[in-house]
């Protein structure tokens, strides 16, 4: 079974800068999975942001600001990366990655 690890416990960024969050997949080939990214703001329900499927297809939640989030995967390091552009107050949250095994 696949296992996920988010090595950064926290990430502190200056406003308007870029944040990159990592999710390391083990126990399964990342190219054979879909990785989903979610965020949870304080006092709010968890929200789907973006996913990258086993074939590289990217799906973004409607209503998410255009160009705010970018998702990628690096097979060599078995890592999925969520990039948050122009970090703002509303981006302060806990971000989770999740796995769907094909």
């Amino acid at each position: 079974a696949g296992h996920l690890e988010q090595p950064q416990i926290s990430s502190t960024k200056t406003l308007s800068k870029t944040a990159r969050l990592e999710c390391v997949v083990s126990g399964i080939t990342i190219s054979a999975t879909s990785v989903y990214w979610y965020r949870e703001r304080p006092g709010e329900v968890i929200q789907f942001l973006v996913s990258i499927s086993y074939d590289g297809t990217v799906r973004k939640e409607s209503g998410i600001p255009s160009g705010k989030f970018e998702v990628d995967r690096i097979p060599e390091t078995s890592t999925s990366t969520l990039t948050i552009h122009n970090v703002e107050k509303q981006d302060i949250a806990t971000y989770y990655c999740a796995l769907w095994e094909v």
Epitope: L15, E44, N86, E88, Q90
Partner: antibody, heavy 124, light 109 residues
Framework: EVQLVESGGGLVKPGGSLRLSCSAS????????MNWVRQAPGKGLEWVSS????????YYADSVKGRFTISRDNAKNSLYLQMNSLRAEDTAVYHC?????????????????WGQGTTVTVSS | DIVMTQSPGTLSLSPGDRATLSCRAS???????LAWYQQKPGQSPRLLIY???SRATGIPDRFSGSGSGTDFTLTISRLEPEDFAVYYC??????????FGQGTKVEIK
């Protein structure tokens, strides 16, 4: 001195348009979310619209959605509200207001700096 | 949408009295997202409390906020003459609109 100064209000006929401006000084404008809040004569406060520091997140009250557009120019330290298809019920004093910003207590929200307001009257 | 209901509509008190203002949300609001404002006639609103209980800069300690979930309270321990005004609560819930309550007027008895 931290200050917000609104302008652009006036008398307009129903269906008309106005563009409100809010000039900010005394703080780093680009670091703060901004809001428009209005108050009809003798009534309470009504939140109208919000825009995040880099303009990624924009929200409107249902009563103005599709008619009003909020924007900002961080290089000019300015906030704007384009108001189209104005109605009599849009008559109010319009205030721009600054969000409390990001601190160690970053989960907190509130409007800590307010402009004096600009009056919009919609009447035929 | 979350509806904020303030009570009472008007509070008639004397200087030195304790004022207790209530704000009830139609659904749960995170404490981080609850603010209180004061507005005097002809003036812009002034932020008193944010995060349900944190006093804004320059606000005297006679003002305090409390509560969680759907019930929040603003307390003025000893009313000063300058405290007679209208008070509004506001929520910044999970999604807009960021609604205000209808206000509570604190007037001199």
């Amino acid at each position: 001195e931290v200050q917000l100064v609104e302008s652009g209000g006036g008398l307009v006929k129903p269906g008309g348009s106005l563009r409100l401006s809010c000039s900010a000084s005394g703080f780093t404008f680009s670091n703060y979310d901004m809001n428009w809040v209005r108050q009809a004569p003798g009534k309470g406060l009504e939140w109208v619209s919000s825009i995040s520091s880099s303009s990624s997140y924009i929200y409107y009250a249902d009563s103005v959605k599709g008619r009003f557009t909020i924007s900002r120019d961080n290089a000019k330290n300015s906030l704007y509200l384009q108001m189209n298809s104005l109605r009599a019920e849009d008559t109010a004093v319009y205030h721009c207001a600054r969000d409390v910003g990001v601190t160690t207590d970053y989960y907190y929200y509130g409007m800590d700096v307010w402009g004096q307001g600009t009056t919009v009257t919609v009447s035929s | 949408d979350i509806v904020m209901t303030q009570s009472p509509g008007t509070l008639s008190l004397s200087p030195g009295d304790r004022a207790t203002l209530s704000c009830r949300a139609s659904q749960s609001v995170a404490s981080s997202y609850l603010a209180w404002y004061q507005q005097k006639p002809g003036q812009s609103p002034r932020l008193l409390i944010y995060g349900a209980s944190s006093r804004a800069t320059g606000i005297p300690d006679r003002f305090s906020g409390s509560g969680s979930g759907t019930d929040f309270t603003l307390t003025i321990s000893r009313l000063e003459p300058e405290d007679f005004a209208v008070y509004y609560c506001q929520q910044y819930g999970s999604s807009p609109p960021y609604t205000f309550g209808q206000g509570t007027k604190v007037e001199i008895k």
